[in-house]
């Protein structure tokens, strides 16, 4: 298990990449002047007391940052949200802090990340650009689920 | 508001079982963890185990490991424990307990009102 | 098995500051331990009063709080009030499981 986050890049399948406006997490065009975050990514220590065949779970926050995605309910369906937070404070927690956990399932060089507290629903993109990330349960219709990781070293 | 209410007290005979029922309201507990605690007359706290009620995975103290079993019924929002082989250093309250991730941190912030098991023969 | 140890008994005058505390056989407590405690008194329910260390839960006086001192997890009650009169138990995260103390007797007299 690793005991330091992992930076990692990440883009959909479109060649958007992620980046940092107004507090909120958008996928923008790779340019020049993009400056893309960094994600950084540990897995929980708690694996063994979580579901089984799901994917790794882990905690995502932005490198340097003390910001850490989140999953929690506005009004009846859960939304994604960047939170103050140290990601090695969640990964030392006594259980998994489970609105900050993803599920993260590969397939070839395809990447998803399934939210841990609302089974489900994953991390997504709208087919358009400028658009902010957000939780889905519509795989592969309008919005975009699959994503590149490259690490970072 | 949130609250715990556990089944009535138990009388057993040692070798026996007891299975300790724990209802929850006011809160989803898919969203929290729920612990077991017990206390032998005069004596201190001491930690069984909990249950994670979304996933129904266990943890337990290793002194309890293999006497204890915990489990949960998400449609009834009940949890259960039950303990077994149990000899006369049993008798106690059991508890059980919520611990929730509030803020920055997990507190055992709710616990049931507890249920008196005594083992005599 | 660590053991977690607590004073048994402490009285604190009305308005005064008592600190108790909760020690660990297996050497100093640390914020890895993630300290909680929960405060018990006579017929009512138990209630938590701290966790991960120096966090007080919601709805928590201002005067209680948690800390470390000299290697132990402490509780510190400022100010103390006649219905603080109660069983103090702490409890302390190793690794995979949780162990409480025995307790501490808190007379407000």
């Known amino acids: 298990k690793s005991e330091m986050p992992q930076p990692v890049s990440i883009q959909d399948i479109n060649h958007r990449v992620w980046v940092l406006q107004d507090q909120i997490l958008i996928a923008v065009p790779r340019k020049d002047r993009v400056s893309p975050v960094t994600i950084s990514l540990i897995s929980c220590r708690h694996v063994e007391t979580l579901e089984k065949d799901r994917g790794n779970p882990i905690y995502l926050g932005l490198n340097g940052l003390n910001l850490c995605l989140m999953c929690a309910k506005a009004g009846d369906q859960p939304t994604l949200q960047l939170k103050e937070k140290d990601i090695m404070d969640l990964y030392n927690q006594p259980e998994p802090v489970k609105s900050f956990l993803f599920y993260h399932s590969q397939s070839g060089r395809n990447s998803t990340f399934e939210s841990v507290a609302f089974p489900g629903w994953f991390i997504a993109v709208s087919s358009e650009g400028g658009c902010p990330l957000i939780l889905t349960q519509e795989l592969g219709k309008a919005n975009t689920t699959d994503f590149g990781l490259t690490m970072l070293f | 508001q949130v609250q715990l209410v556990q089944s009535g007290a138990e009388v057993k005979k040692p070798g026996a079982s007891v299975k300790v029922s724990c209802k929850a309201s006011?809160?989803?507990?898919?969203?929290?963890?729920i612990h077991w605690v017990r206390q032998a007359p005069g004596q201190g706290l001491e930690w069984i185990g909990r249950?994670?009620?979304?996933?129904?995975?266990?943890r337990y103290d290793p002194k309890f490991q293999g006497r204890a079993t915990i489990t949960t019924d998400t449609s009834t929002s009940t949890v259960y424990l039950e303990f077994s082989s149990l000899r006369s250093e049993d008798t106690a309250v059991y508890y059980c307990?919520?611990?929730?991730?509030?803020?920055?941190?997990?507190?055992?912030?709710?616990w049931g009102q507890g249920t008196l098991v005594t083992v005599s023969s | 098995q660590a053991v977690v140890t607590q004073e048994p008994s402490l009285t604190v005058s009305p308005g005064g500051t008592v600190t108790l505390t909760c020690r660990s056989s297996?050497?100093?407590?640390?914020?890895?331990?993630?300290a909680n405690w929960v405060q018990e008194k006579p017929g009512q329910l138990f209630a938590g009063l701290i966790g991960?260390?120096?966090d007080r839960a919601p709805g928590v006086p201002a005067r209680f709080s948690g800390s470390l001192l000299g290697g132990k997890a402490a509780l510190t009650i400022s100010g103390a009030q006649p219905e603080d009169e109660a069983i103090y138990f702490c409890?302390?995260?190793?690794?995979?499981?949780?162990?409480f103390g025995g307790g501490t007797k808190l007379t407000v007299l």
């Open positions: 307990a919520r611990l929730h991730y509030f803020g920055n941190n997990f507190f055992f912030d709710y």
């Open positions: 006011g809160f989803n507990i898919k969203d929290t963890y």
């Open positions: 249950i994670d009620p979304a996933i129904g995975t266990t």
């Open positions: 297996s050497g100093a407590v640390t914020t890895s331990n993630y």
């Open positions: 991960g260390t120096n």
């Open positions: 409890a302390l995260w190793f690794s995979n499981h949780w162990v």
